[in-house]
């Protein structure tokens, strides 16, 4: 606790001190207080600079002085042999002894007091900015009329501060201006306009004068100009120093000007007045401004409308214009509203094509799509080369919008078939030579792929399994090989309504209508082992005549077996109708006059005891196209005979065009329109 | 109809090999695909392998890769399957078997041929 | 391989029951399972192909079921004769592999 006084004795003072003691004291008068120290005994050790023994007096971080040796007073009426006087409140006094005294010293006795200091006067800075009052124990500060004391209460200031401009023109000038300012003074003038307006300084360079910068060039009484995070200034001299036309890009300006104790001039004096905030005209690429004008100022509104194949995008919407405001901060509203390119985006995939993968999906650019060739064509035409269009869609110079279609390329078989030696009499095939093939597993039986969704078959081959299991694909039926190929599940089975069904089957004397269709529920895939064989045309020039040829191809019975494993073919004339009448039925169910023979039925056969035979039914009697000599058509399909290894009857498939067409129509999803 | 004839029963000591044969008859051996299968006493059966005709190539499983080697004369519709490195394990009944179509594995089997390994 | 665990292997039954025998494949097979009986000193005789198609010639009772990895053989009306082994065979693609096998006793 700060004490008022206090005695410090060396250690068994009066007796002689100890060796090797070192012993400090710490002295603390109250705060506003100096502290004068005296001793009235000293006898210690003398050595050079007290290096031995001594009492040192420490101040802070200054030594004070340093005592050894006796001193005695100098005056009769004082028993003060030295006396230290600091204008501090706190000291340290530190008594050190070392390991031997020559002699039996008795240190030393010393007294503190605290004393008054006058702050005014005992220091090198002045406290107070203008009048300084001593009092015991401290000081306190005052002022000269029309000044106030500041928080600090040392600083004394003019009180110009508070004021706030809010009309849109005003004038503003230093405290009694164009007399000399007050000094050490910060006077803060506040202009708050209403917000779209910019607050405009203008200034003459006659009315300024103020103190001038030091050698350093820093102010030192300045006018500064704070907008926001701009600042103007600091501004000082004779004669205004910056732009006469100070705009801020503001609603809001704090004007500071800030003095020192000397150097006093006239001051300074402006105007002010409020602009409609500007809004720059900005360069917005691909796009044309509404109404076009020099100069947009606060609330003007502009229509940026795009240029054709340019967009606006907002989230996940594309828009052609936009609304933009000049707002009251200068700047435009929907600022990061651009005009890109319009984004046509990835270009929609397609069933059995593809597209290459575009270098840029924006506007102008280009893409082709391609079939897989040489299993689908292009249906719908067009090249099937689409450019971004300024819509934002991919578009066909044809088809527009609408996406090209790849279909099967029907009636070319990867390989043509060649007869290797003398179905009935035929030769092995491979299923690249007849890629339509279908074979049932139940009846066995074969069909013909007209498309990815279509089978054609006989009806008799259907008329008992409305669920049939096909496979297409396969060379060999073994079961390793059909486990391999693809298999075809049926979604519907259309027999033709001309078809009789009978209780019993086996009986059957009548196969007029021996067609019938398979809806299948997935698409097939096209490829060298399956493709679709073509229908035929509805002109003459798919009439057939006699001995045009035809391919047959099936895993029927043959020579050695029941069934075959493997594909067999064989290549037939077209025969006249009454040639299969006149063969004798094998193993008739009925009077031979009962088989019923109409134009529906082809006859074809009788040449090297090549036929068609039980297990080939559905399948197709293959010609080739009159109009295009690389495809065939499906011209019959096998149906019934009189004897395998003779002539043999087809359904004739141009009858039932327009049936087939019907049906397909009428039973088709919606993708495949 | 088809019919397998196998050659008879056969005694070898470990480390032998073994040729069993397979006669067709009433079709021809390239019309079919032949496969083996053998069961040894009481236990179950095992499927050793195939000739695909389609492929051209035999086709073993993993367990005899390497001792078995299946063959086809088909100028005598014959098949054979030889075995080596015979070892006890190896006793049993060895089984050709021509493949099914039209989605059943299996058609005509042979009688068995008895092969009994044994020093 | 593909690897065939048929269970239960060995079946214990009185005539007139309805027994079930359960083959799981290691991966899917699509349909292309069979089942096979087989009597002492006999080659093994189809019964269903195809998962659920049954061969001609063999009885109703006889009926399959199951696809992917998880095939059943169900004898509705256990009957003498069918005292025997029953193996399924998984064939999609080669290798070929059988079931380990389910015997069926008399009770």
């Known amino acids: 606790e700060p004490t008022m006084y206090g005695e410090i004795l060396s250690p068994n003072y009066p007796q002689a001190y100890p060796s090797e003691v070192e012993k400090s004291w710490d002295i603390e008068v109250p705060e506003g207080y100096g502290i004068h120290l005296y001793f009235t005994h000293l006898d210690i050790e003398l050595s050079e600079n007290c290096a031995y023994d001594s009492v040192q007096i420490i101040s802070g971080d200054t030594e004070e002085g340093r005592l050894c040796g006796q001193r005695s007073s100098n005056n009769p009426h004082s028993p003060i042999v030295e006396e230290f006087q600091v204008p501090y409140n706190k000291l340290q006094v530190i008594f050190k002894s070392d390991f031997s005294n020559e002699e039996r010293f008795t240190g030393f006795a010393a007294y503190y007091v605290a004393t008054d200091i006058n702050e005014c006067t005992d220091f090198v800075d002045v406290p107070c900015s203008h009048f300084c009052n001593n009092f015991i124990g401290g000081y306190f500060c005052s002022c000269p009329p029309e000044y106030f004391l500041h928080d600090d209460m040392k600083n004394c200031g003019v009180n110009c501060s508070g004021d706030v401009f809010t009309a849109l023109i005003g004038e503003i000038a230093s405290p009694n201006y164009p007399k000399p300012y007050p000094e050490n003074s910060r006077c803060e003038y506040q202009i708050r306009l209403e917000k779209g307006f910019q607050v405009v300084v203008t200034l003459r360079r006659e009315d300024f004068d103020v103190e001038a910068a030091d050698s350093a060039g820093n102010c030192l009484d300045s006018l500064v100009f704070v907008a926001g995070d701009r600042q103007f200034g600091p501004y000082c001299g004779h004669g205004f120093p910056g732009p006469l036309n100070i705009e801020t890009k503001s609603n809001a300006l704090d004007i500071i000007f800030q003095t020192d104790l000397t150097g006093q001039k006239k001051g300074w004096k402006l105007r002010y007045h409020g602009d409609p905030m500007p809004c720059p005209k900005e360069d917005t690429p691909n796009s044309v401004w509404e109404p076009a004008k020099a100069k947009y100022v606060f609330r003007d509104v502009v229509q940026i409308t795009c240029l054709d194949g340019f967009e606006v995008v907002e989230g996940r919407v594309g828009a052609t214009s936009f609304y933009s405001t000049c707002q009251s901060n200068g700047k435009w509203s929907n600022s990061k509203l651009k005009c890109q390119p319009v984004d046509c985006g990835i270009p929609e995939s397609i069933e059995n094509g593809k597209v290459e993968d575009p270098e840029s999906t924006l506007f102008g650019s280009v893409i082709r799509y391609t079939c897989e060739e040489p299993y689908y064509y292009m249906e719908n035409g067009g090249g099937g080369e689409y450019h971004c269009a300024g819509n934002g869609s991919w578009v066909n110079e044809v088809l527009g919008p609408e996406l090209p279609k790849c279909v099967p390329v029907c009636g070319v078989p990867r390989e043509p078939f060649e007869e290797k030696q003398r179905i009935i009499g035929g030769s092995d095939a491979d299923i690249k030579n007849f890629p339509w093939q279908v074979f049932f597993d139940n009846p066995w039986a074969g069909g013909a792929l007209i498309n990815e969704y279509w089978v054609l078959t006989a009806a008799h081959v259907v008329e008992g399994n409305r669920e049939p299991t096909m496979y297409v694909g396969s060379t060999s039926v073994q079961t390793s090989r059909l486990a391999k190929s693809k298999m075809l599940t049926p979604e519907h089975v259309f027999i033709h309504p001309g078809w009789k069904l009978l209780e019993v089957p086996e009986g059957r004397t009548n196969f007029d209508n021996d067609i019938a269709l398979v809806r299948l529920k997935d698409p097939v895939k096209m490829g060298p082992t399956v493709s679709p064989i073509c229908l035929p045309g509805t002109s003459s020039d798919y009439n057939l005549m006699d001995g045009d040829l035809g391919l047959i191809s099936g895993w029927g019975r043959t020579e050695k077996r029941d069934r075959a494993v493997r594909l067999k073919a064989a290549r037939l004339p077209v025969a006249p109708l009454r040639k299969c009448k006149e063969v004798k039925v094998e193993k008739p169910t009925a009077d031979a006059e009962a088989y019923v023979f109409t134009p529906n039925m082809i006859c074809a056969g009788g040449e090297k005891g090549m036929d068609s035979c039980k297990g080939d039914s559905g399948g197709a009697f293959a010609v080739q196209d009159p109009n295009d000599k690389t495809k065939f058509y499906a011209a019959g399909l096998v149906s019934w005979g009189p004897q395998c290894g003779t002539y043999g009857l087809y359904t004739r498939v141009k009858n039932y065009v327009d049936w087939i067409m019907k049906t397909m129509q009428e039973n088709s999803t919606p993708r495949e329109d | 109809e088809v019919q397998l004839v196998q050659s008879g029963a056969e005694v070898k000591k470990p480390g032998a090999s073994v040729k069993v044969s397979c006669k067709v008859s009433g079709d021809t051996l390239t019309e079919l695909s032949m496969h083996w299968v053998r069961q040894a006493p009481g236990k179950g059966l095992e499927w050793m392998g195939t000739f695909d005709p389609e492929e051209g190539e035999t086709i073993y499983a993993q367990k005899f890769q390497g001792r078995v080697t299946m063959t086809e004369d088909t100028s005598t519709d014959t098949a054979y399957m030889e075995l080596s490195s015979l070892r006890s394990e190896d006793t049993a009944v060895y089984y050709c078997?021509?493949?099914?179509?039209?989605?059943?594995?299996?058609?005509?089997w042979g009688q068995g041929t008895l092969v009994t390994v044994s020093s | 391989d593909i690897q065939m665990t048929q269970s239960p292997s060995t079946l214990s039954a009185s005539v007139g029951d309805r027994v079930t025998i359960t083959c799981r494949a290691s991966q899917s097979i699509s349909s292309w399972l069979a089942w096979y009986q087989q009597k002492p000193g006999k080659a093994p005789k189809l019964l269903i192909y195809k998962a659920s198609s049954l061969e001609s010639g063999v009885p109703s009772r006889f009926s399959g079921s199951g696809s992917g990895t998880e095939f059943t053989l169900t004898i509705s009306s256990l009957q003498p004769d069918d005292f025997a082994t029953y193996y399924c065979?998984?064939?999609?693609?080669?290798?070929?592999?059988f079931g380990q096998g389910t015997k069926v006793e008399i009770k």
């Open positions: 078997v021509t493949e099914g179509e039209a989605g059943r594995p299996f058609d005509a």
């Open positions: 065979v998984q064939y999609p693609s080669y290798s070929w592999t």
